[in-house]
């Protein structure tokens, strides 16, 4: 008679995460008496997946019923498949013995491969604003995916990025996997509205993409430009000087305005103006009464904005002889308010 | 059981419309990518298009020139073929298969046959 | 576009092994070509065998196995039997589009 042979017909299984995975496997015949056992791996440190004889195994049910007589069928279900369950297994028979059950033949071993979906991509930024010219760096990142091969793409706006470095991790072998990438963009002024996407395709998603977004309105700040003009005003002792102050990201804007060096008053910028860019506009002006100066004023608007150094706009403001000649020592009446752009 | 059954095939002219159909049975639609191959007269098979789980993402032929347009209707398990300006050489079997994951096509239906001909 | 090409026609016999494969116009076949095996039986019954290079479809007999064999994808049918006479189509996934090969006209005999 021939002797038994132990079947596991498929070389390789490949099922999705979350599913159940069914590993087949034969005899050839009932001799000799003695139970079937299923590892997974070989050598001494294989680990025990199902036990015919004896034990709990909740994950586990077999196809046909193995007390059924003259059964060869010892195939398994095992169910809710993760990546950690990926691994050769193999149907092993023993021969009854005293005291232990002693090892007879094992089959060739069927390869589990798990098919698992990448996470949701996370995009972050940097950690500090920059300013348009400068080139910011957005990392995106997923997990758990497998197999290893994967395709990643950046955007900006709709337009695919080329600077940008992807790893996978790790490099050989393994249940699962790991994509990080960086990618490199060069602000530009009108990046306010802009946003950046990390697309990840994966043979689980269905054809469906995963994408991550990053707002750059997070990453760049848009120094303002100023200009100070003098109004035209009906009162021939009163002059009325403007600041504009331009096209700034993002909102955090303190304007102090400076006669002759010294301060005459400070403002934060409260009601503003929003550009099609995104970026904001906001005006202050200040009555200067012209009666009170002998001499040639220089008004300076000086702005912070966004916590960064200081710039300022100057402005000389001319006295005539006129009202030199007739100067008195009136303190001068200075306002500020805000308005909006001309 | 999975069953793709393709429908909506005949006899058209050249310029005219034909709109394909493939009920599909024994699985979610929505969780499968799906795709038409056509086989003309003799011919191997080509790939026409390919249309993403959810269906907002779809895969053409450069070949087809946006003349066909793959679309789905996930509630009613069925995919389409909307097919324009048809010519004599895009006389062929269609068949509906379906994508086990992206990369394995495993079930196929039966196909259903296009004709163009004045 | 790329051209994917297979062998017209193979013969074997019953209990042989045999091996089709399926080569790129790009290069060497990768598994990011995600290389797949279609089989035609007489009246356009289209089977799924392997998808993703070596995974076979559920139902599909074991003796049907995908491979990469030096720069081509390969279908191996160890021990051929006299039903698997048909058409083996091979297909080839290229960043967005599949291409199919001419196929392979294989006989047992």
């Known amino acids: 008679e021939d002797e038994l042979q132990v079947i596991q017909p498929e070389k390789s299984v490949s099922v999705a995460a979350g599913e159940s995975a069914t590993l087949r496997c034969a005899m050839t015949s009932l001799i000799p008496v003695g139970p079937i056992m299923w590892f997974r791996g070989a050598g001494a440190g294989r680990e025990l997946i199902y036990n015919q004889k004896e034990g709990h195994f909740p994950r586990v049910t077999t196809v046909s019923e193995l007390t059924k007589r003259n059964n060869l069928d010892f195939s398994i279900s095992i169910s809710n498949i993760t990546p950690a369950d990926a691994g050769t297994y193999y149907c092993v028979k023993f021969r009854k013995g005293s005291p232990d059950d002693v090892e007879f033949k094992s089959g060739a071993g069927t390869e589990l491969s798990v098919r698992a979906k990448p996470s949701a991509p996370v995009v972050s930024g940097p950690a500090v604003r920059a300013t348009p010219e400068h080139t910011v760096s957005f990392t995106c990142e997923s997990h758990g995916f497998s197999p290893r091969d994967i395709t990643l793409k950046w955007f900006k706006n709709g337009n695919e990025l080329s600077d940008f470095q992807t790893n996978v991790d790790p490099a050989g072998d393994s249940v699962s996997y790991s994509i990080h990438s960086t990618a490199r963009v060069v602000l530009t002024r009108g990046d306010v509205h802009s946003q950046v996407i990390c697309e990840i395709a994966h043979i689980t998603l269905q054809g469906d993409p995963l994408r991550g977004t990053a707002n750059l309105s997070e990453a760049i700040r848009v120094p303002p430009t100023l200009e100070v003009t003098q109004q035209p005003m009906r009162a021939e002792n009163q002059a009325n000087v403007t600041c504009q102050v331009s096209n700034f990201y993002p909102r955090g804007l303190q304007l102090t305005w400076l006669e002759n060096g010294n301060v005459s008053r400070t403002e934060t910028a409260s009601t503003l103006i929003e550009n099609k860019d995104g970026t904001y506009n906001w005006m202050s002006w200040l009555l200067v009464n012209t009666c009170a100066h002998r001499d040639d004023v220089v008004l300076t608007c000086q702005v912070e904005h966004d916590g960064q150094q200081a710039v300022s706009k100057s402005y000389a403001l001319e006295i005539s002889a006129h009202q030199k000649e007739h100067g008195s020592d009136i303190t001068h009446e200075a306002a500020l308010a805000p308005t909006a752009p001309l | 059981e999975v069953q793709l059954l393709e429908s909506g095939g005949g006899l058209v002219q050249p310029g005219g419309s034909l709109r394909l159909s493939c009920a599909a049975s024994g699985f979610t639609l929505s969780s499968y990518a799906m795709s038409w191959v056509r086989q003309a007269p003799g011919k191997g098979l080509e790939w026409v298009s390919i249309?993403?789980?959810?269906?907002?993402?779809?895969y053409n032929a450069d070949s087809l020139k946006g003349r066909f347009t793959i679309s789905r209707d996930n509630s009613k398990n069925t995919l389409f073929l909307q097919m324009n300006s048809l010519r004599a050489e895009d006389t062929a079997v269609y068949y509906c298969?379906?994508?086990?994951?992206?990369?394995?096509?495993?079930?196929w239906g039966q196909g259903a046959l296009v004709t163009v001909s004045s | 576009q790329a051209v994917v090409t297979q062998e017209s026609a193979l013969t074997t016999s019953p209990g042989e092994t045999v091996t089709l494969t399926c080569r790129s116009s790009?290069?060497?076949?990768?598994?990011?070509?995600?290389a797949n095996w279609v089989q035609e039986k007489p009246d356009h019954l289209f089977t799924g065998l392997i998808g993703?290079?070596?995974n076979r479809t559920p139902g599909v007999p074991a003796r049907f196995s995908g491979s990469l064999i030096g720069d081509k994808a390969a279908l191996t049918i160890t021990g051929a039997q006299t039903e698997d006479e048909a058409i083996y189509f091979c297909a080839l996934w290229y960043s967005n589009h599949w291409v199919f090969g001419g196929g392979t006209k294989l006989t047992v005999l």
């Open positions: 249309s993403s789980g959810s269906g907002a993402n779809t």
């Open positions: 298969a379906r994508l086990r994951f992206f990369d394995w096509f495993d079930y």
């Open positions: 790009t290069g060497a076949v990768t598994t990011s070509n995600y």
């Open positions: 993703g290079t070596n």
